[in-house]
């Protein structure tokens, strides 16, 4: 197949991505004597970067886009893992379109799973956004979660907290959150496994089995939450803690109620 | 570098089996590819048809999946097209490819007739 | 499923340059390969990855990608430049490659 010539060497960063069609014409316009305003690096196309887990078959290619400006013009790098990313890190290296903000991995095999991170910055900031990449077999494979979801969480007493699991599953997955319990005091039953109580399950009733709301939270609802995602191949899961706080003394009402929580527990299996 | 050839029956007749096999030399299926099939109707586009891993894994055009086999023979080096119930709308040159993101190279293409 | 959109014709004069273009939703995510097909024989890989070049093919193929559309530029052009030419992405979304639907290249004169 070609080998391109690794890495290449695109143009510089244009200020005015290519690939954003906003209008850019509310930003002032230099005049012949003036500088031009410093401006720190900012995205110019968000809404092209919320995917940030690409679970991806072996032997594909796979493009990560960071669109950006600033001025002057920014820098692009990429971080694998939080180090630096050399084209000799993998094989047949990987391609940086400066023009377009964008890196390009040809081929990828498994090796190649982790998190990318785009910085972009000029003397004014910096700012930077990761992907994850997942290289799978072709489906059906095991349930894929994105990763930092979901995430923990510290709120006040009676609000409301949302978590997150981002799921990549084929064949259909199914999707329960559980929170793990003390029965009798002890947080693990008889037979070695933590005690648990399903608070949700993709199935009916369930709108939207990826995002668990808890509303007007107790400090009884403290503690680890565990998003599990589990087909017919294999399982996934991934926890979060939610930290329930009081407010300061002279906030407090008068007397506290505390609602009646009723635990219905099985054993995690 | 690597060559690819189909070989199978140029004639297939209405509501049987359409088989082809494509045979790798100059490189091993076992490489970090997809081995592709794409057809192409007389006076008319490319179509992906589908794929396969040397581990077995495939994937298939939607409008064909229900009728669509591709297998591997590594010990052979070769993989095969089965293509179900055919019609006369079936009637095209049929190519394999390597495939990582793209096609490169392709066999040079056979014509499969249906007709009885 | 993933649309891939060209014109079905394109003519140039020899010398002139040819832009073929390739419409799909938010293509320049994706990486955008084409391919020239003469009668009578199988498709050749002339631009991949956007804008990159397989050995053999001649600098006057070149690529871009951004946006909602991909452009194959063939600069200077020959009557030997004179066939069908495709447009192809594997969509990421799906797990499915998608062809265009092929642009028909006529050298004039």
């Known amino acids: 197949r070609p080998s391109p010539t690794l890495p290449e060497q695109d143009a510089l960063p244009s200020s005015e991505d290519d690939d954003d069609d906003d209008d850019s014409s509310s930003e002032e316009k230099e005049t012949d004597n003036t500088k031009p305003n410093p401006v720190a690096p900012y995205w110019t196309s968000p809404e092209k970067m919320e995917k940030k887990l690409h679970a991806v078959p072996a032997a594909k290619t796979v493009k990560f886009k960071c669109p950006s400006s600033g001025t002057p013009n920014p820098t692009l790098r990429w971080l694998k893992n939080g180090k630096e990313f050399k084209p000799d890190h993998r094989i047949g290296g990987y391609k940086v379109r400066y023009a377009t903000w964008s890196i390009i991995m040809d081929s990828v095999v498994p090796s190649d799973k982790g998190n990318y991170t785009c910085i972009v910055e000029n003397e004014y900031g910096s700012i930077n956004h990761t992907y994850q990449l997942d290289v799978v077999e072709r489906s059906p494979h095991r349930p894929i979660l994105q990763a930092g979801l979901p995430a923990n969480k510290t709120v006040a007493l009676g609000s409301n907290v949302e978590f997150m699991c981002k799921v990549y599953s084929d064949p259909q997955p199914h999707i329960q959150w559980l929170k793990h319990i003390e029965v009798n005091g002890s947080k693990i039953g008889p037979d070695n496994l933590p005690y648990v109580q399903i608070l949700k399950h993709s199935g009916i009733n369930s709108s939207d089995a990826e995002v668990l709301t808890l509303f007007n939270v107790t400090e009884a609802q403290s503690g680890e939450y565990v998003c599990k995602v589990s087909n017919y191949i294999g399982e996934a899961n991934q926890s979060a803690w939610l930290t329930v706080t009081r407010p300061a003394l002279e906030e407090r009402p008068a007397v506290m109620t505390s609602p009646l929580y009723l635990e219905h527990h099985h054993h995690h299996h | 570098q690597v060559q690819l050839q189909e070989s199978g029956p140029g004639l297939v007749k209405p509501s049987g089996t359409l088989s082809l096999t494509c045979a790798v030399s100059?490189?091993?299926?076992?490489?970090?590819?997809?081995w592709s099939w794409v057809r192409q109707p007389p006076g008319k586009g490319l179509e992906w048809i589908g794929e396969?891993?040397?581990?077995?894994?495939?994937s298939y055009n939607p409008s064909l999946k229900s009728r669509v086999t591709i297998s591997v023979d590594k010990s052979k080096n070769q993989f095969s097209l089965k293509l179900s119930s055919v019609t006369a709308a079936d009637t095209a040159v049929y190519y394999c490819?390597?495939?990582?993101?793209?096609?490169?190279?392709w066999g040079q293409g056979t014509l499969v007739t249906v007709s009885s | 499923s993933y649309v891939l959109t060209q014109p079905p014709s394109v003519s140039v004069a020899p010398g002139q340059t040819a832009r073929i273009t390739c419409g799909g939703n938010?293509?320049?995510?994706?990486?955008v390969h084409w391919y020239q097909q003469k009668p009578g024989q199988a498709p050749v890989l002339v631009v991949y990855?956007?804008?990159d070049r397989p050995s053999g093919i001649p600098e006057r193929f070149s690529g871009s990608n951004s946006g909602n559309t991909a452009t194959l530029t063939i600069s200077r052009v020959e009557a030997g430049d004179e066939a069908d030419y495709y447009c192809?992405?594997?969509?990421?979304?799906?797990?499915?490659?998608?062809f265009g639907g092929g642009t028909k290249l006529t050298v004039l004169g």
């Open positions: 490819a390597r495939a990582t993101d793209w096609y490169d190279p």
């Open positions: 100059g490189g091993s299926i076992s490489s970090n590819n997809w």
């Open positions: 396969i891993y040397h581990s077995g894994s495939t």
């Open positions: 938010n293509i320049g995510s994706e990486s």
């Open positions: 990855d956007d804008s």
């Open positions: 192809q992405v594997w969509d990421s979304t799906s797990d499915h490659r998608v």
